[in-house]
């Protein structure tokens, strides 16, 4: 549909509240360093302009594209060059190059202070004093720290954030009510951000076809009763939504996501029997619910895949004449039969099938050549199964913290050039796969674990891309999206790495560690562990365990001491000396 004024169209579709929220998110995701007040001012100006266009679509500038309007507005920021440096050069470009330029300058790891949670009473007062500003600030702070956060989903988080304060600020024990809710929102928000970052990386680095293949596999697992044509339609629409959000077109994205939810609910009989509850909810909850809905039951008596994809005389002709359709059907049929497989495994199987057909179809006897193609799948299926089995056993034996430490050591030895904060963050998240997935029965373990690992390894890839330091990381991140995890799993100790010089300052601790939360204390210890491995990459597990046990005892002892600072200074020197001796430094 062509509209005279795109901005008026979106304002009317979304309503003023959502329009303003989405423009704020868009601006905060582009200009991540700008103060809150500046963004609010820009948003208000855009909103007032949109209202004039709603009143008269022929008014001056109302026919301009959203990129032109928003880009022009962002380029009015006076401090653009001093705050953002070369990003200011984007403003000299014309659309669509200007928007592409802004996108390229999005920073996955912006230099922003950590968000410190104020006292509950302080938060409740701020909420009551100015609810609108309080909620806008939430959107702003999340969006600028997570420049690829899925905007319509952030509206859903904001709605829950508001509900938590509305309920808990009236409760007898405000903290007991509010803090668990805020913790849950924080953890879910981080997970949501990381999942969306993978979708955007998939689209931007590997193209639309890679994303569509992922979507075909996932939706076929989720909606196994839906016809291929139905799944294809959903995939096309979902791809449009995510392409828009990843491209900064947040108004279009939110609008199209709402349309998709509406379509799914209107056609749930031909999609899934699990959608009924979701479809009774209001829009934001509905969209979220659909995105998280459990897999429908598989249809009974599905025929063998071999008939259409191995035995049929038309396999090669169908492949050659429309690879996208034929391989899409293969992926659909395989995925709907295998909710027990990870999406990335299904994509590997489809790639193997494609490679085999490409090799065999021009041969003298194509059928004889590809007849055993399904046998080639066996090792591909067994590899993640075995890996998950081994790692879940290790997790059950060690518990989450020590399992994270094992992964920290493993990954630091693989890619020791990567910065310590990145190794700690990524390994801690990799380690969470244990508590997240190992509790599941066999049939749910692989989709949980391997698809989660894809999300976490993507965090490593996007952080590493900003400042590349390891050819091995670059290789695993860029060669194949679906083989990232096997690529990292296959890395051995980097024998070319020259150990880091020993620096006593790295292992000097102070009394402030005693007041940290358990999580923060763990991070301090894990940071030290990474540094140890960087100094002594050939250290054995036993050596590292001994040093870390001594370190834990040292922290515990000094935190109980009367003069903590003196204890940390004196005992710290002894610990460093003992550790150096134990590791032969």
């Amino acid at each position: 549909d062509a509209h005279k004024s795109e901005v008026a169209h979106r304002f009317k579709d979304l309503g003023e509240e959502n329009f303003k929220a989405l423009v704020l998110i868009a601006f905060a995701q582009y200009l991540q360093q700008c103060p809150f007040e500046d963004h609010v001012k820009l948003v208000n100006e855009v909103t007032e302009f949109a209202k004039t266009c709603v009143a008269d679509e022929s008014a001056e500038n109302c026919d301009k594209s959203l990129h032109t309007l928003f880009g022009d507005k962002l380029c009015t920021v006076a401090t653009l060059r001093e705050t953002y440096g070369e990003m200011a050069d984007c403003c000299a470009k014309q659309e669509p190059e200007r928007n592409e330029c802004f996108l390229q300058h999005k920073d996955d790891n912006p230099n922003l202070p950590r968000l410190v949670r104020p006292e509950v009473d302080v938060m409740c007062t701020a909420f009551h004093d100015n609810e609108e500003t309080f909620l806008k600030k939430y959107l702003y702070e999340i969006a600028r720290r997570h420049p690829y956060f899925y905007a319509p989903e952030l509206l859903f988080f904001a709605k829950r954030y508001k509900a938590a304060f509305t309920e808990c600020c009236q409760a007898a024990d405000k903290a007991a009510c509010l803090l668990p809710k805020l913790d849950e929102l924080r953890d879910e928000g981080k997970a949501s951000s990381a999942k969306q970052r993978l979708k955007c990386a998939s689209l931007q680095k590997f193209g639309e076809r890679a994303f569509k293949a992922w979507a075909v596999a996932r939706l076929s697992q989720r909606f196994p009763k839906a016809e291929f044509a139905e799944v294809s339609k959903l995939v096309t629409d979902l791809t449009k939504v995510h392409t828009e959000c990843c491209h900064g077109d947040l108004l279009e994205c939110a609008d199209d996501r709402a349309d998709l939810a509406k379509y799914i609910c209107e056609n749930q009989d031909s999609i899934s029997s699990k959608l009924k509850e979701c479809c009774e909810k209001p829009l934001l909850e509905k969209s979220h619910c659909i995105a998280e809905v459990e897999n429908d039951e598989m249809p009974a008596d599905l025929p063998s895949l071999a008939a259409d994809f191995v035995e049929s005389k038309d396999v090669c002709k169908n492949y050659a004449e429309a690879k996208d359709v034929f391989l899409g059907m293969f992926l659909y049929e395989y995925a709907r039969r295998h909710p027990d497989y990870s999406v990335v495994l299904l994509l590997r199987l489809a790639k193997t099938y494609e490679t085999t057909l490409e090799k065999c179809c021009a041969a003298a006897d194509p059928h004889e050549c590809y007849a055993k193609v399904f046998d080639e799948f066996k090792p591909l299926v067994e590899e993640p199964q075995n890996l998950i089995k081994q790692n879940c056993e290790l997790f059950e034996q060690l518990g989450e913290y020590k399992f994270q430490n094992a992964l920290l050591v493993r990954y630091t030895k693989k890619v020791p050039q990567v910065s310590t904060p990145t190794l700690v963050e990524v390994s801690r998240n990799l380690g969470k796969v244990g508590s997240k997935c190992c509790k599941h029965p066999e049939a749910k373990r692989m989709p949980c674990a391997e698809d989660y690992l894809s999300v976490v390894l993507n965090q490593l890839c996007v952080l590493h891309e900003k400042t590349p330091v390891s050819d091995r990381v670059t290789k695993c991140c860029t060669e194949s999206l679906v083989n990232r995890r096997p690529c990292f799993s296959a890395l051995e100790v980097d024998e070319t790495y020259v150990p880091k010089e020993f620096n006593a300052e790295t292992f000097t601790f102070h009394a402030d560690i005693c007041t940290l939360s358990e999580k923060e204390r763990q991070i301090k210890k894990q940071t030290a562990l990474v540094e140890l491995v960087k100094h002594k990459p050939k250290a054995t597990k036993e050596q590292l365990k001994a040093v870390m046990d001594d370190f834990a005892a040292f922290v515990e002892k000094c935190c109980k001491a009367d003069d903590k600072e003196t204890c940390f200074a004196e005992e710290g020197k002894k610990l460093v000396a003992a550790s150096q001796a134990a590791l032969g430094l």
Partner: antibody, heavy 119, light 110 residues
Framework: EVQLLESGGGLVQPGGSLRLSCAVS????????INWVRQAPGKCLEWIGA?????TTFYATWAKGRFTISRDSTTVYLQMNSLRAEDTAVYYC???????????????WGQGTLVTVSS | DIVMTQSPSSVSASVGDRVTITCQSS???????LSWYQQKPGKAPKLLIY???KLTSGVPSRFKGSGSGTDFTLTISSLQPEDFATYYC???????????FGCGTKVEIK
């Protein structure tokens, strides 16, 4: 020595037909895909179609109907009907790299045969 | 419709120069099905690179292919006398029937 050798080109009137041959020596034709590609004077390369070892044929969208590819044990043929002035070109046969079926990787080419369509 | 755009259409360079030729495809090629050919006057094309970056055996390492999806590049790091020729890219798509070549880049002596 592995060789592809085209023949059958020449002058033909608009509306006429011509059959080009691609004689293959040094390799067993029953194991390879052979393509026909043409190049108008000073112009782009243009893929016409392919025949797989199994005899299955494929054509560029624009070539369907007027062009037919066939083979026997040592020769691949390109039958061209209803020829037009714009079909004037050098016609090449080329082998697809072994291990590929639909990719545009042609590692062995003939020397080409010139077809001129003119009244 | 498939469009394969090569640029520049011609380039004048000297021996030892670095030459870069680009090929843009709309839509994106299938699975990095992109090749580069070299053709000298009166001769058949010669396959240099396949799968966007793999060198055919016997092709000197000064030829380098890169890119993915829609944007591809052929780089000749240090032009030799025998490299003066016309270079074509070729793309494979979802349907074999859409196999398409670019219209060439002529590398001439300056």
């Amino acid at each position: 020595e592995v060789q592809l050798l085209e023949s059958g080109g020449g002058l033909v009137q608009p509306g006429g037909s011509l059959r080009l041959s691609c004689a293959v020596s040094g390799i067993d034709l029953s194991n390879y895909a052979i393509n026909w590609v043409r190049q108008a004077p000073g112009k782009c390369l243009e893929w016409i179609g392919a025949i797989w070892a199994s005899g299955t044929t494929f054509y560029a969208t624009w070539a369907k109907g007027r062009f037919t590819i066939s083979r026997d044990s040592t020769t691949v043929y390109l039958q061209m009907n209803s020829l037009r002035a714009e079909d004037t070109a050098v016609y090449y046969c080329a082998r697809t790299v072994p291990g590929y079926s639909t990719a545009p990787y042609f590692d062995l080419w003939g020397q080409g045969t010139l077809v001129t369509v003119s009244s | 419709d498939i469009v394969m755009t090569q640029s520049p259409s011609s380039v004048s360079a000297s021996v030892g120069d670095r030459v870069t030729i680009t090929c843009q495809s709309s839509p994106s090629v299938w699975s990095n099905f992109l090749s580069w050919y070299q053709q000298k006057p009166g001769k058949a094309p010669k396959l240099l690179i396949y799968e966007a970056s793999k060198l055919t055996s016997g092709v000197p390492s000064r030829f380098k292919g890169s890119g993915s999806g829609t944007d591809f590049t052929l780089t000749i790091s240090s032009l030799q006398p025998e490299d003066f020729a016309t270079y074509y890219c070729g793309g494979g798509y979802s349907s074999i029937s859409d196999t398409t070549f670019g219209c060439g880049t002529k590398v001439e002596i300056k």
